[in-house]
Amino acid sequence: EPHSLRYNLTVLSWDGSVQSGFLAEVHLDGQPFLRYDRQKCRAKPQGQWAEDVLGNKTWDRETRDLTGNGKDLRMTLAHIKDQKEGLHSLQEIRVCEIHEDNSTRSSQHFYYDGELFLSQNVETEEWTVPQSSRAQTLAMNVRNFLKEDAMKTKTHYHAMHADCLQELRRYLESSVVLRRRVPPMVNVTRSEASEGNITVTCRASSFYPRNITLTWRQDGVSLSHDTQQWGDVLPDGNGTYQTWVATRICQGEEQRFTCYMEHSGNHSTHPVPS
């Protein structure tokens, strides 16, 4: 599982006039991490775990980065020609990743009124545009604006992604929070299904990092994939994750089934409550 930093910025226009504010959220390893507080002109940590990532740092750099990015995106929106009356939005999602082998990946996506119209793979410098004519027009608008000073733009986007990776590395290096190991709390529950059957659910919560194996076993052997239902591994808002796996079994055979969990080199088995 790679470490990732994801920026989500949105700017708005009303009747062709670009609005002064911007919305910004940053996710770190899939967790809500920062948001920009417009009223206080500050990047604000999302929860105690985010505060802990930088310890006693002031979020000064993050505030300046988001402010600069918001300004850039407002300028980009101002160059989109087809803005009609009413409210319109330009959204930019930027992601950078560091993989276990230390390789990196960066991408960028632009959405107009919620519709994707331009994507870039930063490593290959490849731009992708969906087939629709509206997307083609919007993409041409934005590409032309970005190409007005081609070298500056190229430098700008490479610098932007280098900054993203630099920030991500900084968080990873400086933060014990992101190097910590939090074992999951595992809870097994049962509920009546159809006659003679019960559904058993195994929930793992409050674990970090995100990688986990959670599976049902019968007589010590893992059940086949298609006899189990898995939930997504989702952030729980506290800097940790949660997930679940469920299966249907015959009533009376509960003692043959266990939930197997493996996380950060530790494993455990959990029986079905009688």
Epitope: C41, T58, D60
Partner: antibody, heavy 118, light 107 residues
Framework: QVQLQQPGAELVRPGASVKLSCKAS????????MNWMKQRPGQGLEWIGM????????RLNQKFKDKATLTVDKSSSTAYMQLNSPTSEDSAVYYC???????????WGQGTSVTVSS | DILLTQSPAILSVSPGARVSFSCRAS??????IHWYQQRTNGSPRLLIK???ESISGIPSRFSGSGSGTDFTLSINSVESEDIADYYC?????????FGAGTKLELK
């Protein structure tokens, strides 16, 4: 134009709390953080803390957590700093200053000179 | 707390000379340093923000440079009105801290 008005001086008895004021004008008071600094005679500046008038969110230097209490009165566009249980160590000039961008202080009051003496 | 060490404590210069003030941080603070001027019996005035960004209304003879731990404020041609104390302030870590200041005086 932006102005931060502070009383020139306050004479305080040891142990008797004092509330210093900073009246803001010429800008939207609830849109900017207000910071407070301490400067002892012939010495440098110390940051005490900051408050955002919109909702009174406060960030205090841990060194002053028992010494200073920051408040605002939105109706009069005034920021206050109460000095609790003052001693001679608290004799200093206290400045309020508006924050222009993140953590940079563009407008300062004239300072209130506090003398703690019996 | 981040310690900001300013040197020298006192700088004596002739009018028209170029002068540089040094501010060294006890650890990396990126470019989160700001410079203030305080004349005798006056309030501090912001001169430079974020190491090198100029401030509206501040004469162009004031400039700043540096990043990481070493920062410099320069006045390229000192005038008599520049006689004052100069302070650096960091905003990268809580609490915000100031240097002890450098006093500029005329020879």
């Amino acid at each position: 134009q932006v102005q931060l008005q502070q009383p020139g001086a306050e004479l305080v008895r040891p142990g008797a709390s004092v509330k210093l004021s900073c009246k803001a004008s010429g800008y939207s008071f609830t849109s900017y953080w207000m910071n407070w600094m301490k400067q002892r005679p012939g010495q440098g500046l110390e940051w005490i803390g900051m408050i955002h008038p919109s909702d009174s969110e406060t960030r205090l230097n841990q060194k002053f957590k028992d010494k200073a209490t920051l408040t605002v009165d939105k109706s009069s566009s005034t920021a206050y700093m109460q000095l609790n249980s003052p001693t001679s160590e608290d004799s200093a000039v206290y400045y309020c200053a508006r924050e222009m961008g993140p953590y940079t202080l563009d407008y300062w009051g004239q300072g209130t000179s506090v003398t703690v003496s019996s | 707390d981040i310690l900001l060490t300013q040197s020298p404590a006192i700088l004596s210069v002739s009018p028209g000379a170029r002068v540089s003030f040094s501010c060294r941080a006890s650890q990396n603070i990126d470019t989160s340093i700001h410079w203030y001027q305080q004349r005798t019996n006056g309030s501090p005035r912001l001169l430079i923000k974020y190491a090198s960004e100029s401030i509206s209304g501040i004469p162009s003879r004031f400039s700043g440079s540096g990043s990481g731990t070493d920062f410099t404020l320069s006045i390229n041609s000192v005038e008599s009105e520049d006689i004052a104390d100069y302070y650096c302030q960091q905003s990268n870590y809580w609490p915000l801290t100031f240097g002890a200041g450098t006093k500029l005086e005329l020879k």
